[in-house]
Amino acid sequence: ELCDDDPPEIPHATFKAMAYKEGTMLNCECKRGFRRIKSGSLYMLCTGNSSHSSWDNQCQCTSSATRNTTKQVTPQPEEQKERKTTEMQSPMQPVDQASLPGHCREPPPWENEATERIYHFVVGQMVYYQCVQGYRALHRGPAESVCKMTHGKTRWTQPQLICTGEMETSQFPGEEKPQASPEGRPESETSCLVTTTDFQIQTEMAATMETSIFTTEYQ
């Protein structure tokens, strides 16, 4: 089931999924001056079977001025600069996200894609937060949020993160150990079934990460 909304916004922080659950949708959007090819897909969809997950459909952009050029190539470094990131790009590669059953890795860029990626997450998806450059993380608990189904409605848990305006940057997913396990987080509704998945596996995976490229910015 798709989550009703985006993860919560934390001032001066960005969120990022390490891997995307099957059912996740990604908008195929193009930057200004470009548009989707005629009859091109509006979305990519993470699909799969028991052994392998991958993104269905391809996003393709073409110049708004010309109708006959279609390109789908990895952008040059100068083109990639246009994508919004937190400037903490590291040569270190993330853990192999394909090793997480039922999940897709981050789709590769497509030429002339929009400056920001728009994902539609599903129940059970976990995202991780990090303070933007120039802000320091103060943790009261896990700097993550998970989309849960409660009483037939979806909601995101509140990440326990405050970003203070100090000049030192913190490591991802947090320089301090979380004070509470994800399961120990207080819930507003305890009288009904709560559907959660992937806490353990995603938390372990995140612990192996030192840095990550973020493409979602706090607005």
């Epitope: 908008n27 959007e29 193009c30 989707r36 979305y43 920001e116 728009i118």
Partner: antibody
Framework: QVQLVQSGAEVKKPGSSVKVSCKAS????????INWVRQAPGQGLEWMGR????????DYAQRFQGRVTITADKFTNTAYMELSSLRSEDTAVYYC????????WGQGTLVTVSS | EIVLTQSPGTLSLSPGERATLSCRAS???????LAWYQQKPGQAPRLLIY???SRATGIPDRFSGSGSGTDFTLTISRLEPEDFAVYYC?????????FGGGTKVEIK
Amino acid sequence: QVQLVQSGAEVKKPGSSVKVSCKASGGTFSRYPINWVRQAPGQGLEWMGRIIPILGIADYAQRFQGRVTITADKFTNTAYMELSSLRSEDTAVYYCARRDWGDYWGQGTLVTVSS
Amino acid sequence: EIVLTQSPGTLSLSPGERATLSCRASQSVSSSFLAWYQQKPGQAPRLLIYGASSRATGIPDRFSGSGSGTDFTLTISRLEPEDFAVYYCQQYSSSPLTFGGGTKVEIK
């Protein structure tokens, strides 16, 4: 709970323009597509176009291209649809809807074009 | 553009009966990006099904969607009095988004 509240009914003369607003509250606005769909009296639903507020780029149905302008203000969580060169056939209820599969809809705005 | 054709145009049934509505696409709807809506007079459409088979929040389980490619079906297992309305299918696989012409489910 997500709510989309649209501006009130309008009566317009042929050749003029109308601008309908759609204010969102209670959920994600700037990162999800806002679509505009119209329904003429006794007819079906017709998609006009969409915008993703955070990107500010709109996408229009071919038949409305050049006559419709969709904009959004992500600070006030409001989307706008302006239709120009109005004719009597544009008399319809105009709806805004969040996401491309319309998970939430505005209540509709009746636009009557009459001389 | 993808043209959606709904059938029948009108379905006359009694409460308690099963309703089967069809939506056929002129070309394949990728990844089953198809939605179903219910609309009652004077009201905005209400999302019932997205992704061809996923029920929207708060929709009773008597509503179910199925199909892929070019043929999709909305089934109402046991019609309740409040289910008599017009039903639309819509694809969001590619732009322009398109709707079917609608099926009116009326009381027999």
